[in-house]
């Protein structure tokens, strides 16, 4: 098993399928400039000027506010870009690497988005929502479909629903065939983990959203994070708990729009 | 052609306050962030505030904060910047220009009005 | 906020000469961006997104630079380079310029 710090940042959807086009509305991409504006990241619109994805997507060195744009939802990447400025990056001050944790971060739009029936925001979980195993979860993005294999032109945006997994059985699984003492955690509390040996985030799905229907209302429970390679014999995906970071995320983003 | 015409500079006593104005023309003036931009006589190019194209989001240098309000009136492709508690070091050609939607240099540039600020 | 601090404040050179202007940044920036005015003149975009050159400047100007370091080349100095060059940050607000470089002909 790779060793500590061998760990990857999520990347694509690993058995999956194009997600519906009417499903997902407030999945976004986030594009760093280049040659073209290319995809690195996902994210999720929790407000209409408010954007959610992963630290590592951006910090610990953030970039230039003219190095990034965001898009939102589009079935196919590249396809009809709308590309929106970002006025202010926010990582979370104790964010320093994803299996650290805090790996959480905010992205603020010049202008809010008008939104409609394809493009609104999701969202977030009051505080005493755990996400037990069992529950109806999804994830999303336009990253990896296998470990190191791209996701193929037109580049549409896929879904995988993946099982949730209790933190003390995920950490466990992490401890096998892995270099770190039984009692050092792995899957800390500020985390979640999804996902198996046939469904599970990838490289390129970094910050995108981790969603569950609770009650009839998607909920985002979690922030595509880090795991170690994708879809790996227990090795599932772990995802920043949003839960854990609404004081933080509330700080900054009115609770209603 | 592509233009920034700015005005209202003039003399103003200290503590006093101006409202300067910046007519676009030649571009589809909502579509575009923009921004002041100050130079003292003698001295170096100083960033005062920055608006949004649909004026969301603004920002202002720290010297300039809570004295200095920018805003904007899209249909009628003006930029303006309210200026009170003026002091001397206030003293300023005043500059407004236009932020590129691709690359965000400062592409476009006015020819600047004048504000001393003197008793 | 990010200091930029450009050196040297002023310098001359002689026609044919090369001359570098840096800009050094208080923190990293993604790009570092250059502007030149002349004496009663509004300042002009000369480069953008570290190396890429504004509509119109002569192709004897480069840009170069990462991180904390960047700096303004002129291969091969004309007379009319003569002028103040800024550079300018836009990592994050608050936006400020470097006090500029006085490029004098010798």
């Known amino acids: 098993a790779p060793a500590p710090g061998q760990a990857l940042q999520r990347v694509g959807i690993v058995g999956g399928q194009e997600a519906p086009r009417s499903k997902w509305p407030w999945q976004v991409s986030l594009r760093v400039h280049g040659p073209y504006w290319m995809h690195f990241c996902g994210g999720s619109l929790i407000h209409p000027q408010w954007v959610l994805t992963a630290a590592h997507c951006v910090g610990p060195d953030v970039k230039d506010l003219a190095a990034l744009r965001v898009q939102l939802r589009e079935q196919h990447l590249y396809y009809q870009d709308q590309l929106l400025p970002v006025s202010r990056i926010i990582v979370h001050p104790q964010f320093y690497t994803a299996q650290i944790g805090a790996d959480i971060a905010l992205l603020e739009l010049e202008e809010p988005v008008n939104v409609s029936s394809h493009v609104h925001t999701v969202t977030l979980p009051p505080a005493s929502e755990t996400f037990p195993p069992g529950m109806p979860c999804w994830v999303t993005g336009w990253g990896d479909v296998d470990n190191d294999e791209r996701l193929p032109p037109p580049f549409p945006l896929k879904q995988v629903k993946v099982p949730i997994m209790e933190n003390h059985i995920c950490d466990a699984k992490y401890h096998l065939g892995a270099y770190t003492g039984d009692d050092v955690r792995i899957v800390r509390d500020d985390m979640l983990c999804a996902g198996n040996t046939r469904r599970d985030s990838c490289q390129g799905d970094s910050g995108g959203p981790l969603v569950c229907k609770v009650n009839g209302t998607w909920l985002q429970a979690g922030v595509v994070s880090w795991g170690e390679g994708c879809a790996q014999p227990n090795r599932p995906g772990i995802y920043t708990r949003v839960t854990y970071y609404l004081d933080w995320i509330h700080h900054y983003v009115p609770k209603k729009p | 052609e592509v233009k920034l015409v700015e005005s209202g500079g003039g003399s103003v006593q200290p503590g006093g306050s101006r409202k300067l104005s910046c007519a676009a023309s030649?571009?589809?003036?909502?579509?575009?962030?923009m921004v002041w931009v100050r130079q003292a006589p003698g001295k170096g190019l100083e960033w005062v505030a920055f608006i949004s194209s649909g004026s969301s989001t603004v920002y202002y240098a720290d010297t300039m904060k809570g004295r200095f309000t920018i805003s904007r009136d899209n249909p009628k492709n003006t930029l303006f910047l309210q200026m009170s508690s003026l002091r001397s070091e206030d003293t300023a050609m005043y500059y407004c220009a236009r932020r590129d939607n691709y690359d965000w240099y400062f592409d476009v540039w006015g020819t600047g009005t004048t504000v001393t600020v003197s008793s | 906020q990010i200091v930029l601090t450009q050196s040297p404040a002023i310098m001359s050179a002689s026609p044919g000469e090369k001359v570098t202007i840096s800009c050094s940044a208080s923190?990293?920036?993604?790009?570092m961006y250059w502007y030149q005015q002349k004496p009663g003149s509004s300042p002009k975009p000369w480069i953008y997104r570290t190396s890429d050159l504004a509509s119109g400047v002569p192709a004897r100007f480069s840009g170069s630079g990462s991180g904390t370091s960047y700096s303004l080349t002129i291969s091969s100095m004309e007379a009319e380079d003569a002028a103040t060059y800024y550079c300018q940050h836009y990592h994050s607000y608050p936006l400020t310029f470097g006090a500029g470089t006085k490029l004098e002909l010798k």
């Open positions: 923190s990293s920036v993604t790009y």
């Open positions: 030649g571009f589809t003036f909502s579509d575009y962030g």
